[in-house]
């Protein structure tokens, strides 16, 4: 019996087609992805093949103005239109709290939403009961397939699930659910989830009875043969893991942003054992036409986005200096504002010993692309912020050693004075540079805000200590020459859309007045 698994993950609000790098589509003839194009390909496969499942491994939420405006209603609407068969909860599905998951998505989805390792407690338990499930048995042709879900247990540090959801260890939580499916005579089981490629492989190895793992979170690109675009494969598709009980378990992921549709064909014997598995992600490029009815629906939903862009989010009573002559040379108050918003967006009081899990932000000055004048009645709109942060990035959470941070700050001023973009703006950091010293030895003081403290204060950076830092994905990927961050980061979790982080902060504060306050000094 042959099953075709079509899968997406980490779509992050890319409902419209995008450029090759998943930013805003500029040249339509070269654009990719989007739900209208995805639907064309899915329908084509559904017509050609008998047993097809369309699955999503989480993080539909967060990433563009679509999510900012529609808050998840767009996800439910278009996933329903594409007739997804199941979805696993990702960490970003909790970005607007549990209510922001229940109302727009859980209550509206016409497909099961899954996670076996999230357990509700207290008053939430009855409220959310039945809205998401640990597993679902789906009829496919003449057979049944069990889908069991999982979600990153780091979610409380990455999003806003509140205090009434417990995120258990994935493997511990999955095993009893898979065992339950086995007792129900379900012998073809897919683990669908959002914990990253390393955990996907562990699940394939450790969870007895799982036949296939469809993952997300790490934006992993797997491919067999010559890759069709610029993503470099992390391994072959499917990636085969030998389980502890000796089975060959295919593990797949389909990069991110709806650029590819994962396509996996599995052949099972009559006892539900995987005999063979093969496939590849399908690049959703412009050779695949956009479905006209879905496209028309997208255009209808788009209208509200254009109106939103010009609405006031909040006010500034000071000039927000986002000029290159400030932000690429010295501390600028636009940099301070953005870093403060980045930290505020990551407030998670998850441990009594820590006032917060992260206190530090770094931001390349070259990523700030416009000032905002307070003399326009102080009004700040999404449109204004889109000029400040025009590149459509995310603000991510990384873990770095102190020694890596020191290298990053040396890099910040290694060729100071040429209006180059690597000059770092900061939050939760006090740095002093001496430009009379030679490049690579210009940081004379680097103090960081403590997290394991009840009264936050600045302490000298420790070279061997591991720190959490919020920074743009551009820096996490080694941009502006920050190769040391890319090479030495110990953990990297994708965060929220940059403009969304700043707009949420401004809306929350209502009136802002960021100052230049001595975060960056020159001796």
């Amino acid at each position: 019996w042959e099953l075709t698994i079509l899968h997406t993950n980490d779509v992050h609000s890319r409902l419209e087609q995008t450029s090759e790098d998943s930013s805003k589509c500029v040249n339509a003839s070269r654009c990719m992805g989007g739900v209208a194009r995805l639907f064309t390909k899915v329908q084509q496969i559904r017509r050609a093949e008998p047993n097809v499942l369309l699955l999503d491994a989480g993080d539909q939420y967060q990433g563009t103005i679509w999510f900012t405006v529609y808050k998840g209603a767009e996800v439910a609407h278009f996933m329903n239109a594409l007739r997804y068969d199941a979805m696993a909860l990702g960490n970003h599905e909790f970005d607007n709290g549990v209510e922001g998951l229940i109302e727009p998505l859980l209550k509206e989805a016409k497909f099961p939403i899954l996670s076996a390792n999230i357990k509700a407690k207290g008053p939430l338990a009855s409220q959310i009961s039945g809205l998401y499930l640990p597993y679902k048995v789906l009829p496919v042709g003449d057979e049944v397939v069990g889908i069991v879900g999982y979600t990153s247990k780091e979610t409380p540090f990455l999003s806003n699930p509140g205090t009434n959801l417990v995120f258990e260890d994935e493997i511990t939580a999955l095993q009893p659910e898979v065992d339950k499916l086995k007792t129900l005579n379900v012998n073809k089981i897919i683990a669908l989830g959002h914990s990253g490629f390393e955990m996907d492989k562990l699940i394939a190895q450790k969870v007895r009875g799982v036949d296939v793992v469809v993952g997300g979170h790490s934006n992993t690109f797997l491919y067999t043969g010559n890759p069709p675009s610029k993503e470099v494969p992390a391994g072959k598709y499917p990636f085969i893991v030998t389980s502890d009980d000796g089975r060959k378990v295919p593990v797949v992921q389909a990069y991110a942003f709806g650029k590819y549709l994962g396509y996996l064909k599995i052949e099972f014997d009559e006892r539900g054992n995987v005999i063979s598995s093969h496939g590849n992600p399908i690049l959703l490029n412009s050779s695949i036409p956009e479905d006209p009815s879905i496209k028309a629906d997208i255009n209808k939903w788009r209208i509200k986005l254009d109106n939103y862009s010009t609405q006031e989010l909040g006010k500034t009573i000071v000039y927000l200096d986002g000029s290159s002559q400030s932000c690429r040379f010295r501390e600028c108050n636009m940099g301070n504002l953005i870093c403060d918003a980045m930290i505020n967006n990551n407030l998670r009081h998850t441990d009594e010993m820590f006032w917060n899990h992260v206190s530090m932000c770094i931001l390349n000055g070259g990523g700030i692309r416009s000032p905002i004048d307070e003399r326009n009645n102080g009004t700040i709109t999404w449109e204004n912020l889109a000029a400040v942060l025009p590149f459509g990035g995310t603000f991510d959470l990384v873990q770095l050693k102190g020694s890596t941070l020191k290298k990053a700050f040396e890099h910040s001023v290694h060729r100071y004075g040429q209006s180059t973009g690597e000059f770092l703006q900061v939050g939760g950091i006090h740095v002093v540079y001496d430009l009379s010293r030679k490049p690579g030895d210009r940081v004379v003081k680097l103090d960081v805000l403590c997290t394991k403290c009840r009264v936050p204060s600045y302490d000298p950076l420790k070279m061997d200590e591991v720190y959490k830092v919020i920074l743009p994905n551009f820096l996490a990927n080694g941009g502006d020459g920050f190769q040391m961050i890319k090479d030495e980061l110990l953990r990297h979790d994708s965060g929220d859309q940059d403009i969304n982080v700043v707009s949420t902060y401004i809306s929350k504060m209502k009136v802002i007045y960021p100052a230049v306050e001595g975060r960056i000094k020159f001796s």
Partner: antibody
């Protein structure tokens, strides 16, 4: 569709002046540093000048310093190059381009400047 | 910072593997880009940050190097690859190499 269209080129006598324009569309012009690059007939590429996104920083090649001025008008999505005291060696196709070696790297089709008596 | 490209011209056949080198007069970390230019056309960015492939550029193009020595490699020449190639540093005010003309053997 991203477009950069240069204009203002032509024949000018040595010592004369010319003002080149570059009209931008299809992207957030005010968010990009902009460059002028030139190419003499049959020769290689030579960088001329750059201006930061909001206009506060300008840098020039030594060969044009003091003679050429780069400017921009973000409200009109336009980049300019004012060229004074022109010399025969300034004869070239002049390109305007967004940030060189950046993710969004775009070039115009060029405008020919000929300095000759 | 001066950029020296070699060779200045090169003849090769379709299917060949071709390497062009670029040397900077002082260390430029990875602030190096490679461009392709065809007659009468504007330059086209192939690679930036020494090794990052620009969107839409075929994977047969690759870049490597750091500091002062850099390489552009075309793994299997296609007919459309015959053109002039330039390296360009952006460590300080930008400067291009003198170009390498790649022609059909």
């Amino acid at each position: 569709e991203v477009q950069l269209v240069e204009s203002g080129g032509g024949l000018v006598q040595p010592g004369g002046s010319l003002r080149l324009s570059c009209a931008a569309s299809g992207f957030t012009f005010s968010s990009y540093d902009m460059h002028w690059v030139r190419q003499a007939p049959g020769k290689g590429l030579e960088w001329v000048a750059v201006m930061s996104y909001e206009g506060s920083n300008k840098y020039y090649a030594d060969s044009v310093k003091g003679r050429f001025t780069i400017s921009r008008d973000n409200s009109k999505n336009a980049l300019y190059l004012q060229m004074n005291s022109l010399r025969a060696e300034d004869t070239a196709v002049y390109y305007c381009a967004t940030e060189i070696a950046a993710k969004g790297d775009y070039w115009g089709q060029g405008t020919l400047v000929t300095v000759s008596s | 910072i001066q950029m020296t490209q070699s060779p200045s011209s090169l003849s090769a056949s379709v299917g060949d593997r071709v390497t062009i080198t670029c040397r900077a007069s002082q260390g430029i970390s990875n602030y190096l880009a490679w461009y392709q230019q065809k007659p009468g056309k504007a330059p086209k960015l192939l690679i930036y940050a020494a090794s990052t492939l620009q969107s839409g550029v075929p994977s047969r193009f690759s870049g490597s190097g750091s500091g002062t020595d850099f390489t552009l490699t075309i793994s299997s020449l296609q007919p459309e690859d015959f053109a002039t190639y330039y390296c360009q540093q952006s460590y300080s005010t930008p400067h291009f190499g003198q170009g390498t003309r790649l022609e059909i053997k």
